[in-house]
Amino acid sequence: EINGSANYEMFIFHNGGVQILCKYPDIVQQFKMQLLKGGQILCDLTKTKGSGNTVSIKSLKFCHSQLSNNSVSFFLYNLDHSHANYYFCNLSIFDPPPFKVTLTGGYLHIYESQLCCQLK
């Protein structure tokens, strides 16, 4: 189920690459975030908490990523026109309950100015 377009700036361009921002509520403690290109899983990151509140971060499909208390950023490099597509953040929330999944996304437009050496 697609819950809709991201209501924030999802794509941030840097030097021929793009940072894709996937947000989640800061109350969420354990989750899986997947970055989808069309229907294909490009990246994922899972945050879990063990005994003693030890945090574990795992990736089955690894991309350069950055985790904050309310977002996961995935970084794609060496942009070319083939990167233009719909990208979705697929968030599965495990804790706190209830278990829920939400999908938000947007279209990544690639312009010539973003392909190389442009700092936005």
């Epitope: 189920e1 819950n3 509520p25 109350i27 599965s92 929330i93 495990f94 706190p96 309950p97 209830p98 278990f99 829920k100 999944v101």
Partner: antibody
Framework: QVQLVESGGGLVKPGGSLRLSCEAS????????MSWIRQAPGKGLEWVSY????????YYADSVKGRFTISRDNAKNSLYLQMNSLRVEDTAVYYC???????????????WGQGTMVTVSS | DIQMTQSPSTLSASVGDRVTITCRAS??????LAWYQQKPGKAPKLLIY???SLESGVPSRFSGSGSGTEFTLTISSLQPDDFATYYC????????FGQGTKVEIK
């Protein structure tokens, strides 16, 4: 049709125990997370306990933690609530309800049972 | 814990009226909000989930809106069958219900 039927309610003295059952039919029970919710006479709704589709994840409201135990038997399409050390304030109608499916795509609490009354009184 | 506050507690209305019930969360719950209808002696019935999605089989006169902390349930034209108590419920973090709004005949 899709339905939930609770049983096991009744009158019990403070400190006593009861076991509530909820029998599911009309859907694949093992695909769904389930909850118990209660409603004291003339009052609002209060979530009590929640169990994942496999039974591996279980949560309780603070008001019942350590006294109530939720469980399920997917082979019997049944949900249970074992209630120990009952208090007067546990008096309520207890509902079982179907929560989301294991894909997380279901709507919340879309099917409820008719409820079973638990009265705790000396 | 996330607290849910509903207003008004009681609402007197007539058949055909447009009715609005408000629910406020103590912190942002995004769109993780459901609305239920309950009649005396009966179990609650799901009307709306994810703040604005209409549950299958629920009449289109019911609608939900809002996100973050402010939500509304609207009945566009009140019908005799709609006199009941309505509850909001957040499900971002565990579950909390509002205290209920009783819609009664004016």
């Amino acid at each position: 049709q899709v339905q939930l039927v609770e049983s096991g309610g009744g009158l019990v003295k403070p400190g006593g125990s009861l076991r509530l059952s909820c029998e599911a039919s009309g859907f694949t029970f093992s695909d769904y997370y389930m909850s118990w919710i209660r409603q004291a006479p003339g009052k609002g709704l209060e979530w009590v306990s929640y169990i994942s589709s496999s039974g591996s994840a279980i949560y309780y409201a603070d008001s019942v933690k350590g006294r109530f135990t939720i469980s399920r038997d997917n082979a019997k399409n049944s949900l249970y609530l074992q209630m120990n050390s009952l208090r007067v304030e546990d008096t309520a109608v207890y509902y079982c309800a179907r929560d989301e499916d294991y894909h997380g795509s279901g709507s919340p609490r879309d099917i409820w049972g008719q409820g079973t009354m638990v009265t705790v009184s000396s | 814990d996330i607290q849910m506050t509903q207003s008004p507690s009681t609402l007197s209305a007539s058949v055909g009226d447009r009715v609005t019930i408000t629910c406020r969360a103590s912190q942002s719950i995004s769109s993780w909000l459901a609305w239920y209808q309950q009649k005396p002696g009966k179990a609650p019935k799901l009307l709306i989930y994810k703040a604005s999605s209409l549950e299958s089989g629920v009449p289109s006169r019911f609608s939900g809106s809002g996100s973050g902390t402010e939500f509304t349930l609207t009945i566009s034209s009140l019908q005799p069958d709609d006199f009941a108590t309505y509850y909001c419920q957040q499900y971002l973090s565990y579950w909390t219900f509002g205290q209920g709004t009783k819609v009664e005949i004016k």
